[in-house]
Interface confidence: medium
Amino acid sequence: MAGPPRLLLLPLLLALARGLPGALAAQEVQQSPHCTTVPVGASVNITCSTSGGLRGIYLRQLGPQPQDIIYYEDGVVPTTDRRFRGRIDFSGSQDNLTITMHRLQLSDTGTYTCQAITEVNVYGSGTLVLVTEEQSQGWHRCSDAPPRASALPAPPTGSALPDPQTASALPDPPAASALPAALAVISFLLGLGLGVACVLARTQIKKLCSWRDKNSAACVVYEDMSHSRCNTLSSPNQYQ
C-alpha cells in the first residue's frame, strides 16, 4: 500500500535536492573537466567559469590538509603555491579562467576545486587529476558523467580548518540563520529518498552470505565497483 506513494515521492525529493544549490546561491562555478588522466610530465587544463560578480578565485587541492594552489584576481599578480611555481599558466579572466598545470608529477594526483569569492562561498564540482606512469595509463580511465557544482553560503558563525586561506561573503543574516534548519530538513528528506531508492533498487550491492554457523550470523558484503571509476567523484566538501 505504501509502495506507490514512495515511488511518487522519490522524483520529488531528487528534484528538490538538485535544485538546492541554485536556491541557496544565485551563482555556480562551472568547472571542467570533471576527471582527467595524464602521464607524468604532461599538462592539464582546468577551467573555472562563473556568471560574474566575482572578486577572485582560488584553485584548491582537497585532501586531509587542503591547500590553495593558486589565487587569481583580475589586475593582480597571481599567487601560486611554491610546489607549483613555474608550472602554472593562466588564460582568460577571473570570470572564465583556464589554469594550466605543467610537468605533472605522480604526487600531483588529486582533486582540485575552484573556489570563487562572491557574496557566498561558491565551489566548483572538482576535477580529479590522475597522473600515471606512461605504461600504466590504460588502467585508469575517466567516465563521462560530470558531478554537479555546489554553491553554499558560509554561515556567519565560526569554526576552523587546518589551512587558513579564506573566503565567504556577506550573507543575508536572515537567510544565513535559516540555512542550518533548511539544510537539516533537506538532508533528512534526501536521506529518506536515497533510502527509498536503495530499497527499490538493490542492484549495486550484492550480499554474498557464504556461510553461517550457530555462533555467527556473519554476512560478507561486496560492493560492485565495476563501473564506478571516476563516477565516484562528488561535489567537494567545503569543510575540507
Epitope: 565560526g158 576552523a160 580548518l161 587558513p164 579564506t166
Partner: nanobody, 117 residues
Framework: QVQLQESGGGLVQPGGSLRLSCAAS????????MGWYRQAPGKQRDLVAS???????TYADFVKGRFTISRDNAKNTVYLQMNSLKPEDTAVYYC???????????WGQGTQVTVSS
C-alpha cells in the same frame, strides 16, 4: 595555521572614530581573504567587511560609507577604520580568514568597541 590578534577597540562617543588592527602570524596571510566580524551581546556574529589578497573589498549594508577595510601584506595586518560610529556599532570585533570563518571552531579574543555618550 594563521593566528590572529585583534586590537584598537575602546570606548568612543557617537560620531567618533576608531581604527582596529588585526595582526596575523603565519605564511599564508598574503593569500588569505580576510574579514572583520562583529558580535553584539545576544546576537549572532555578522560579517562587517572583507578584503581579498588583491584589495577587493565588500561591506555589509549597515557599515557602508562609514567603515573601511584595508590590509598591509608586508606587515601581515588587516585594518578596519571605523568613522561616524553609532551606539548600535557596540560589539566585540573579530578578524578572521574570510573563506573559512563560517567553519572555524576558534576565534581570537576580539576587541571590544563601545559607542556611548
Amino acid at each position: 595555521q594563521v593566528q590572529l590578534q585583534e586590537s584598537g577597540g575602546g570606548l568612543v562617543q557617537p560620531g567618533g572614530s576608531l581604527r582596529l588592527s588585526c595582526a596575523a602570524s603565519g605564511s599564508k596571510f598574503s593569500i588569505a581573504t580576510m574579514g572583520w566580524y562583529r558580535q553584539a551581546p545576544g546576537k549572532q556574529r555578522d560579517l562587517v567587511a572583507s578584503i581579498t589578497p588583491g584589495g577587493n573589498t565588500t561591506y555589509a549594508d549597515f557599515v557602508k560609507g562609514r567603515f573601511t577595510i584595508s590590509r598591509d601584506n608586508a606587515k601581515n595586518t588587516v585594518y578596519l577604520q571605523m568613522n561616524s560610529l553609532k551606539p548600535e556599532d557596540t560589539a566585540v570585533y573579530y578578524c578572521n580568514d574570510f573563506r573559512l570563518a563560517g567553519l572555524r571552531d576558534y576565534w581570537g579574543q576580539g576587541t571590544q568597541v563601545t559607542v556611548s555618550s
